[in-house]
């Protein structure tokens, strides 16, 4: 889980090992602070938790990609 | 394509434990999430637990808390489901069943493992 | 817990006739930003394992023969057969994954009148 050191920054200290079904995921951000020790994505589910995930991961990437089509296609 | 073997038949008495197994093939094995499902005859499904890669464990149903235990593993593709302290409300087939990346729900299942309890 | 109620319990049509199934969540399993409802129909026949029919509420599995079909959205789900045929006899169920503990519908057995 991700974690907030000093508010506004989280950081992430740890990433999952398994992949997340992708319909799971309802949004993601990027970490990217000076202050963290790794470069992080956080993903939001539809339940409203929170995953730190490693952004080199192709599962991760896929995910991103898929989250950022979802967002640009208007709602019928 | 995901394929769920299940392992054969158990007869158990009451008060004792089974373990019934589910190899996977097909697929990268921790890229899924198994859970287990079972039916007692003549009823309906019921969920038991699985792997939830949101919590980054495996969880349980309410009901089955403290009795059944998952476990898994990497090694041979394979997931194990325990259940102890039976008794003959246990009698069931059970499933093991799974998800990949782009699904969610239950898209594969194994064969089904009868566990009859009797004394 | 989300808790997924179906009715009729069990149904007799005749050959060639609609069958309807309902089901109802306890709470909404519509997820509004992908505009999805997390719920699947499962067939179930005996001696076998249940098979997918229908998943996102409305989308057919492949190989599934066009005359099943879902609809709903929110708390409200419908499986229809629009022309009963032998091989459908089976029981029939509803399961939201929406949130975990996934649950199930008690089932619909449909039958041949």
């Known amino acids: 889980q991700p974690d907030a050191i000093n508010a506004p920054v989280t950081c992430c200290y740890n990433f999952t090992n398994r992949k997340i079904s992708v319909q799971r995921l309802a949004s993601y951000r990027r970490i990217t602070s000076s202050k963290c020790p790794k470069e992080a994505v956080i993903f939001k589910t539809i339940v409203a938790k929170e995953i730190c995930a490693d952004p080199k991961q192709k599962w991760v990437q896929d995910s991103m990609d898929h989250l950022d089509k979802q967002t640009q296609t208007p709602k019928t | 394509q995901v394929q769920l073997v299940q392992s054969g038949a158990e007869v158990k008495k009451p008060g004792a434990s089974v373990k019934v197994s589910c190899k996977v093939s097909?697929?990268?094995?921790?890229?899924?999430?198994i859970h287990w499902v079972r039916q007692a005859p003549g009823k309906g499904l019921e969920w038991m637990g699985g792997f939830d890669p949101e919590d980054g464990e495996t969880i349980y149903a309410q009901k089955f808390q403290g009795r059944v235990t998952m476990t898994e593993d990497t090694s041979t593709d394979t997931v194990y489901m325990e259940l102890s302290s039976l008794r003959s409300e246990d009698t069931a087939v059970y499933y093991c069943?799974?998800?990949?990346?782009?699904?969610?729900?239950?898209?594969?299942w194994g064969q089904g493992t009868l566990v009859t309890v009797s004394s | 817990d989300i808790v997924m109620t179906q009715s009729p319990g069990s149904l007799a049509v005749s050959l060639g006739e609609r069958a309807t199934i309902n089901c109802k969540s306890s709470?909404?399993?519509?997820?509004?930003?992908?505009?999805?409802?997390?719920l699947t129909w499962y067939q179930q026949k005996p001696g076998q394992p249940p098979k997918l029919l229908i998943y996102w509420a409305s989308i057919r599995e492949s190989g599934v023969p066009d005359r099943f079909s879902g609809s709903g959205s929110g708390s409200n789900f419908t499986l229809t057969i629009t022309s009963l045929q032998a091989e459908d006899v089976a029981i029939y169920y509803c399961?939201?994954?929406?949130?975990?503990?996934?649950?199930f519908g008690q089932g619909t057995k449909v039958e041949i009148k």
């Open positions: 709470q909404s399993i519509l997820f509004r930003s992908n505009n999805k409802n997390y």
């Open positions: 069943a799974t998800n990949d990346f782009w699904s969610g729900y239950f898209d594969y």
């Open positions: 399961q939201q994954y929406y949130s975990s503990p996934w649950t």
């Open positions: 097909g697929h990268i094995f921790t890229e899924l999430s």
